[in-house]
Structure formats: C-alpha cells, structure tokens
C-alpha cells in the first residue's frame, strides 16, 4: 500500500509538474522590463515570453504582440521554445507509459511488466524536468548576466519574470514525482503479494532483472 | 548636452606615474557608469576600465590591474585614472567615455588626452 | 579573450554605394556587439548598438545585422560625410574588445 501510495503522490507531482511548465512556457512573463526613467512621465512594464511580449502602461491597459518570423528570431528563444515543447511531450508520453503499468489498470498484467513501465515512466519524468530546466537556467543566466554587464543600458537590462519561478517549480516538480515513481519499483520480486498474485500462482516464477541491469543509457 | 572633457596627459618616463582627469557636465553624473578607453597611434581602440555608477564596481583588463585605478568624486562630478608603473605600451589618447540609459556600450566620448610614455 | 577580426581593412567605394563592414567574433557573444564610427581627428561616435539598434540621430542608410557569430554594418546609400574608420566591439563579458577598423574612403 505504501508503494501505491508512493505511485499516486509521484504522478500527482508530475501533473502538477506538467501543468506548471505549461504555464511557464505560454506565459510573456520571462523576462520583466521596468521604464521608469527621469523624463518618461508615464511608467511602463515589458514582458517578454517565448511566444510574444506585452506592454503594460501605468494605467493598467495591456498591449500583447505576437513574434512575427520564426527565423528572425534569436537562436536561444528558438532553442527555449524547442525544449519547453519537447519537454511538455515528454511528460505527457511519462504519463502514457505510467497509465500503461499503474497498479489500477489492467493494460498490462504482469506485475514486473507493470513494474518496469512504471520505472520508465520514473525516468522519462525525471528527463523532463531536466528538459524543463535547461531554458530557464539559460534565460536567467543570461538575466543575470546582463544585470552585471557595467556595457549593457539599464533599459536594456531584465528581471526575472514568473514564468522562470514557474517554470523551476515545473521541473522541481517533474524531478521530484519522477524519482517517487522510480523509487517505488525496487525490484520486481521485491514487492510485497498483491491481488494480481493468485492469477500466477501456479505459473513458474518469472526471472526478473533488478533495475540496475536495465539498458537505462536510452533514457539519459 | 553632455560634455566630457579629460585632461593631464603628457610625456612621462617609463616606470613613472600620471593621473587623468574627466570633467562631466550636462547631466547628472552620479547617475550612469563611465570607462576609459585609450588608442595608440594608428592602433585599434582598446578597453582599459569601467566604474559603475555610484563607484561601488570597477572593473580592469588584465593588461592594466594592479596599475590603474579608476575612481569618481561625485561632488565635483569628476572621474579619474590614476596610472602607475607606466610603460612604452601605455602610450595612446586615452578617451572618457559616459554610458548611456537606453543605449549599451560606449555611448558618449571626450576628445581624449595623449599620453606618451618615453625615455 | 574574445577576439574581433574585422574586414575589409580599407574600402573605397562611390557616392551612392552600397557598402558593408563585417566583424567576426571568435565565439559567441550573442547580440552583443557595437559599431563606432571615427571620423578624421575626432572622438569615436557610437552608430549602433545590441548588434541592429542604432542609435537616435543616426541617419537610417546605417543598418546592422548578425548571422551566428559574424556581424555586419551596412551603408545603403554611402554619402560623402560618411568618410570615416569603422569599429566594431564586443561586450558580452570582459575584457570588452574591440576590431582592428575599417577606414572607408571615397572614389
């Protein structure tokens, strides 16, 4: 029961995971522009996302434009976009392959099979997290950097937008439910009995594979 | 309008010492980030050192650390490179440069000092 | 450090040409690249900054652009004013360099 538990709280985690890196990657709030400077009278705030960036006056009014070429855009937004889409795809082939071996379903009934395809769904979880991470470590790397580039005009300069917060919280998130759902599949042999047990029992044991001695370096 | 306007250069023995000075006017000088930039004759222009606003960071090529020094006096909205342990390659008009709001790099020039360093 | 080949060394070109100064940065310095333009016996003026953002009060027939790591600065309509020694600089970490310039001359 621990290990059902432990299941249900892993893909829990990713969904939440999921949700929060679909947000982080549709949302213009990566990097947040502030213009308050001596001779400009009315304040305004620049967000730029992924997808499109919005201008918010003082008075509240909001003006969002989508980017126009895909070509004509800078090679790291190209590549931000690229991961944040790949990454959202693999979490939800993570879920596919869970639902595949989860312990309610009957997809597949052999508990090692059911074992394994929970492991690889651990594992394409955790990947993307890691997918999820990589553009918004960049982008606030280069936040960062340019917040301490004495070259760069401070109307040049970006804070960190809520999409990155979000989008840490996402692979956070997808790290850590990946991880509970790995842990939760030690060995097959290892699991206590379970009401798929009396269907084999007359069946010769099955020889099954720890973890370790899976071919994992396909999911790395 | 902006005026940078450097002066104390001058002909120096190698190993000797100068400092430049940068008088700023037309805007408020605490507020943005000045640099030095020098160029030897019939050379490329060359970084030598930065201070942001407010002098809390400096920053130096390694060609210069540990022999200039850049410092600003807000009060008398100056900035200034004090040059030690001056040599041959040190020879250039060395130029006061003012950052910019909206614009990055170099945005405001002086008309620079010649230093020449000779025996 | 990063290194800044600029080319051609010198130009000659006529009233009216189309004329174009290209930097090479030995790695990446993203968009983070500035032209300056010396003009005989006067201080550098900045044209453009952020590799393709030209500054307010430069005439419109100076253009940048980037490609990778290979920049450059365009002149539409060369003008005879425009004779001058172009740099170009880096500033995406320090030390900030700069090329070795192009002198543009006119035919």
């Known amino acids: 029961m621990a290990s059902a538990g432990m299941q249900i709280l892993g893909v829990v985690l990713t969904l939440l995971g999921w949700v929060n890196g679909l947000v982080s990657c549709a949302l213009p709030m990566w990097k947040v522009t502030a213009f308050i400077g001596n001779s400009i009278v009315v304040a305004q705030v620049v967000w730029e996302g992924l997808w499109m960036s919005c201008v918010v006056q003082s008075t509240g009014q909001m003006q969002c434009k989508v980017y126009d070429s895909l070509l004509a855009l800078p090679q790291d937004l190209q590549a931000a976009r690229a991961l944040c889409v790949i990454a959202l795809l693999v979490a939800l082939f993570g879920l596919l392959v869970y639902l595949a071996g989860a312990k309610c379903t009957t997809c597949v009934e052999e508990k090692d099979s059911k074992a394994r395809l929970v492991l690889t769904s651990g594992i394409v979880f955790v990947i993307s997290g890691v997918l999820t991470l990589i553009p918004v470590c960049w982008t606030a790397h280069a936040i960062i950097r340019d917040f301490y580039n004495p070259l760069v005009a401070e109307a040049q300069k970006r804070e960190l937008g809520a999409s990155l917060y979000l989008g840490w919280a996402a692979s956070g998130l997808l790290l850590l439910g990946g991880g509970l759902l790995c842990c939760t599949c030690p060995s097959g042999g290892s699991q206590g009995p379970s009401h798929y047990m009396a269907r084999y029992s007359t069946s010769a044991p099955a020889i099954s594979r720890g973890p370790s001695e899976y071919p994992t370096k396909n999911y790395v | 309008e902006v005026q940078l306007v450097e002066s104390g250069g001058g002909l120096v023995k190698p190993g000797g010492s100068l400092r430049l000075s940068c008088a700023a006017s037309g805007f408020t000088f605490n507020d943005y980030t000045m640099s030095w930039v020098r160029q030897a004759p019939g050379k490329r222009l060359e970084w030598v050192v930065t201070?942001?606003?407010?002098?809390?960071?400096?920053y130096y090529p390694d060609s210069v650390k540990g022999r200039f020094t850049i410092s600003r006096d807000e009060a008398k909205n100056s900035l200034y490179l004090q040059m030690n342990s001056l040599r041959a390659e040190d020879t250039a008009v060395y130029y006061c440069?003012?950052?910019?709001?909206?614009?990055?790099?170099?945005?405001?020039w002086g008309q620079g000092t010649l230093v020449t360093v000779s025996s | 450090d990063i290194q800044m080949t600029q080319s051609p060394s010198s130009l000659s070109a006529s009233v009216g040409d189309r004329v174009t100064i290209t930097c090479r940065a030995s790695e990446n310095i993203d968009s983070y690249l500035a032209w300056y333009q010396q003009k005989p016996g006067k201080s550098p003026q900045l044209l453009v900054y952020?590799?393709?953002l030209l500054v307010d009060g430069v005439p419109s027939r100076f253009s940048g652009s980037r490609s990778g790591t290979q920049f450059s600065l365009t002149i539409s309509s060369l003008q005879p004013e425009d004779v001058a020694r172009y740099y170009c600089q880096h500033y995406y970490s320090i030390p900030y360099t700069f090329g070795s310039g192009t002198k543009l001359e006119i035919k």
């Open positions: 440069i003012r950052g910019d709001y909206r614009y990055d790099a170099f945005a405001y």
């Open positions: 201070i942001s606003s407010g002098g809390g960071r400096t």
């Open positions: 952020a590799s393709t």
